[in-house]
């Protein structure tokens, strides 16, 4: 009610002889500040004196002085809120009731606190979760209802008497609600922790043992099993007997069911701790284990690999890889179920034993066509020899072999003929599916492997064919040796190197680019007249009369070929000059007279000079000299000179006679 002082503190505090006690305490006085405080041990109220009797452990005076014998007990509070106390050291006879007598100006109060001091350090208390399961993290708690600032302690966890390695978290509480020291240890128990002793040990600051609490771990776990087999190596022969025993090394709680598994599958009607296998067959080879269940779940033993030994079964051959390419490597593997594994093998190729081949694998580093065929093997172990299986077929693939190009025509082949060629080969695997020809042309292939060349050209020198399956094999080129008339016949001047001047020595060559056959004859012709039968036509001293159109012919057994006409040009100085007169060499004065300088020259005359009877050159340089009107004085002998790049020529004198006209005669 409102007439009470309000106090907060732990109801009971625990300690032991020689330790200390720290009493956290708060209060609220009814009025004003605290004026007097007395700490009683086991106070008793005396009705006669209306005061409390008992041992006074602490007494505060108005002046705040404390007698020296009270140093063991300390009031750590104040005048209005804090009433914390410390007793250090605490003794066994301090057990009982502590009475806090508080007085203010007008009010008084007695607050009682229980103190429990034991002769020896009391043990902490281990708290476990209600259930511990293997591999599930748990927290172990060690609680001690003691904490005091003046007396440091530690809690240590032990497993089977030795310190636990896991990290523990220690906490202390010194509050008005509770006083304790607590250590919490988190760990993940395994089934093997079951039944083990865990200790929480209370130690002083120096690690000296004070007290402890122990618990036995009850770790729930699936059954832990051991499997034993007779014979111990679990290797038997067909017809033998085998016994397997399942032993439970640990189960918590107790196991409920037992079963056996082979290769992970449950064996029916096998629900005892012993598995008896009588007259075993090879099919009973495999991995066996026992499974025992409890409320936590099933536990399995390690697997026992039972090997039932038997002679090799009929073998099969595996080829890596078929079809094989010639030149590649191939591996043959002899596969035969046997226990123990075969130790020896016999290999057969097309039914014939392969000498020196006794391994499970046969390796051929470089396959050849003759390696093709059927491969079989026989496996052998300590129990016997197996049967030869059906074998496997090795297909060796290779490009077409010995490819040749064959000319079907009668020889020789002439230009323009139709030529037929065939592509032949010796063997091929896989079969030839196509052919290729070189060089490529617009030729027809009337059937597979046959080439027809219509109107064969003179220059179709060689042809090669390829027969192709997955690969192409080329034949050596075959020469068609096409025969043809001489080609590209032409006339070539050998000398002189420059233009031909009259009197030069001249040689003409009849050239051709090719001829097959090579043996040829030559013919030279000018204006349809045969000049010679040599490859060269020679002129010791050429004359203008030799100029003209020349042709040469070259012929062989196939035919003859003519060159284009070649013009022979001879350069010479003007010659055969003469002066012609028009209308004649006798002209009447007053008329017109034309003198023409005629010549034969190559190149033509480029420059003319006229002379009179006095050899005086006249101021005229054209081919014609026109006199108009002509005078009697013009009468006389005239000559002309012609010039070209080669030289000069002069004409003989030609006389012009100018006679008087009738008029002139009439005047005279």
């Amino acid at each position: 009610d409102s007439s009470k002082w309000v106090f907060e503190h732990p109801e009971t505090l625990y300690a032991w002889e020689g330790a200390c006690v720290w009493i956290p305490c708060t209060y609220r006085a009814l009025d004003g500040d605290l004026e007097s405080f007395i700490l009683f041990h086991n106070p008793e109220y005396n009705k006669n004196t209306s005061k409390f009797d008992g041992t006074r452990l602490y007494e505060s005076t108005k002046d705040g002085k404390v007698p020296s014998e009270q140093k063991r007990v300390q009031f750590l509070g104040d005048k209005n809120k804090n009433c914390t106390l410390s007793i250090h050291p605490v003794h066994l006879n301090d057990s009982g009731q502590l009475g806090l007598r508080m007085e203010s100006k007008t009010e008084k109060w007695m607050e009682r606190i229980h103190l429990n001091v034991s002769e020896r350090p009391f043990p902490p208390h281990i708290q476990l979760p209600p259930e511990i399961q293997e591999s599930q993290e748990v927290t172990l708690t060690c609680l001690l209802n003691f904490s005091c600032y003046g007396y440091p302690i530690q809690l240590q966890w032990l497993l089977e008497g030795v310190p636990m390695r896991q990290a523990a978290v220690t906490s202390t509480s010194l509050t008005i609600k509770s006083v304790f020291t607590r250590s919490e240890l988190k760990f993940s128990p395994q089934w093997s922790h079951h039944g083990k002793i865990v200790t929480c040990q209370l130690q002083d600051a120096d690690g000296k043992f004070l007290s402890n609490d122990t618990v036995q771990l009850n770790v729930k776990h699936t059954p832990k099993l051991e499997i034993k087999v007779t014979p111990s190596d679990a290797i038997v022969r067909e017809g033998d007997s085998v016994t397997m025993t399942c032993e439970v090394s640990s189960s918590n709680p107790e196991y409920t069911t037992v079963s056996w598994l082979k290769d992970g599958t449950s064996l029916k009607k096998q629900n005892t701790f012993t598995l008896n296998l009588r007259e075993v067959t090879k099919d009973q080879s495999g991995k066996y284990c026992c499974q025992v269940s409890n409320d936590v779940g099933p536990g399995r033993s390690e697997e026992v690999f039972l090997q039932v030994q038997y002679a090799p079964e009929p073998s099969t051959v595996q080829i890596l890889h078929s079809p094989a390419v010639e030149g590649s490597q191939v591996e043959f593997l002899c596969m035969s179920l046997a226990n123990p594994l075969p130790t020896n093998y016999t290999w057969y190729h097309n039914g014939k034993e392969m000498q020196g081949r006794t391994e499970e694998k046969v390796h051929i580093p470089k396959i050849l066509p003759w390696h093709a065929g059927t491969y079989s093997c026989v496996a052998e172990n300590i129990l016997g020899t197996g049967q030869r299986g059906p074998g496997a077929e090795l297909d060796v693939q290779y490009p077409p072999k010995k490819v040749t190009t064959v000319i079907q025509n009668p020889m020789p082949i002439r230009e323009g003929d139709t030529v037929t060629l065939s592509c032949n080969y010796n063997s091929s695997n896989p079969s030839v599916t196509r052919y290729e020809w070189k060089p490529h042309g617009a030729w027809e292939e009337p059937s597979l492997g046959v080439l027809k060349i219509q109107n064969v050209g003179w220059d179709n020198t060689t042809i090669a064919c390829a027969a192709c399956n997955s690969w192409c094999s080329w034949a050596s080129p075959v020469a068609l040796n096409v025969q043809y008339a001489p080609r590209d016949v032409r006339v070539r001047k050998i000398k002189p190197l420059s233009e031909i001047h009259s009197g030069n020595s001249v040689s003409l060559q009849c050239d051709f680019s090719s001829s097959h056959p090579k043996e040829v004859q030559f013919f030279w012709e000018k204006n349809g007249r045969l000049l010679g039968k040599e490859s060269q036509l020679n002129f010791d001293s050429i004359s203008p009369e030799d100029a003209g159109s020349y042709s040469c012919w070259v012929n062989n057994s196939i035919g003859q070929t003519a060159s284009k006409a070649w013009t022979l040009e001879v350069l010479y100085a003007p010659r055969r000059l003469r002066v012609s007169m028009s209308p004649g060499d006798q002209v009447m004065e007053g008329k017109s007279a034309t003198l023409t300088c005629e010549s034969d020259a190559n190149p033509p005359v480029s420059h003319y000079t006229w002379f009179d009877w006095n050899n005086q050159s006249l101021p005229y340089h054209s081919q014609k000299l026109r006199l108009e009107p002509v005078k009697v004085q013009h009468s006389g002998a005239y000559w002309c000179q012609g010039t070209n790049s080669v030289g000069k020529g002069r004409s003989p004198l030609s006389t012009l006679t100018v006679y008087y006209s009738p008029e002139t005669i009439g005047r005279r």
Epitope: E137, L158, L159, E160, G161, P163, R165, Q166
Partner: antibody
Framework: QVQLVQSGAEVKKPGESLKISCKGS????????ISWVRQAPGQCLEWMGW????????IYAQKLQGRVTMTTDTSTSTAYMELRRLRSDDTAVYYC???????????WGQGTLVTVSS | EIVLTQSPATLSVSPGERATLSCRAS??????LAWYQQKPGQAPRLLIY???TRATGIPARFSGSGSGTEFTLTISSLQSEDFAVYFC??????????FGCGTKVEIK
């Protein structure tokens, strides 16, 4: 200083038994546990089991249960590990290691090479 | 049992560089994880325990971090003597221990 000294290398045949010793010195032998760990060539470390030198109680790895026995002789501060029915896959280096306790530091033996071969 | 997975299997680092090694637990192991160094022909040597506390005599360049299921060992500046195999070990189920298969730290 703390030291763990193991017995020397062994060569065994399949089916035989093996017993390795581990002598502790430089500390209070009974205040700690001893773990046994093995390492097969090129493999991970594998914990085999533990014994409390305080009272001789043991915890074994399940896969070795029934084949392994760990003991101590407190008078000579020596721990022993016996492995029976040896197999070729028991070839390994076997180590003993002292528990770290509250200090955090652990100590290992130098290792014993065991070869199991027929 | 608690399975520890270490990554990477091999770590190629140049001397002076930083190396970060990872260890993952299949179940929480709180901070009950240790790191070991092993050199050829030698026993493992404790580096870190309690996930982050350096063992006696271990240089400050080695540091550990993490809790629960994810843990990291960091070597801040690799020295020539640090090239070795590093294992993590959980002791949450002590005395039953499990180890990671290791990370090999090799010279780049």
């Amino acid at each position: 200083q703390v030291q763990l000294v193991q017995s020397g290398a062994e060569v065994k045949k399949p089916g035989e038994s093996l017993k390795i010793s581990c002598k502790g010195s430089g500390y209070s032998f009974t205040s700690y546990g001893i773990s046994w760990v093995r390492q097969a060539p090129g493999q991970c470390l594998e914990w085999m089991g533990w014994i409390s030198a305080y009272n001789g109680n043991t915890i074994y790895a399940q896969k070795l249960q029934g084949r392994v026995t760990m003991t101590t002789d407190t008078s000579t501060s020596t721990a022993y590990m016996e492995l029976r029915r040896l197999r070729s896959d028991d070839t390994a280096v076997y180590y003993c290691a002292r528990d770290p306790g509250v200090t955090g530091d652990d100590y290992w033996g130098q290792g014993t090479l065991v070869t199991v071969s027929s | 049992e608690i399975v520890l997975t270490q990554s990477p299997a091999t770590l190629s680092v140049s001397p002076g560089e930083r190396a970060t090694l990872s260890c993952r637990a299949s179940l929480s192991v709180s901070s009950n994880l240790a790191w070991y160094q092993q050199k050829p022909g030698q026993a493992p040597r404790l580096l870190i325990y309690g996930a982050s506390t350096r063992a006696t005599g271990i240089p400050a360049r080695f540091s550990g971090s993490g809790s629960g299921t994810e843990f990291t060992l960091t070597i801040s500046s690799l020295q020539s003597e640090d090239f070795a195999v590093y294992f993590c070990q959980q002791y949450h189920s002590w005395p039953a221990l499990t180890f990671g298969c290791g990370t090999k730290v090799e010279i780049k």
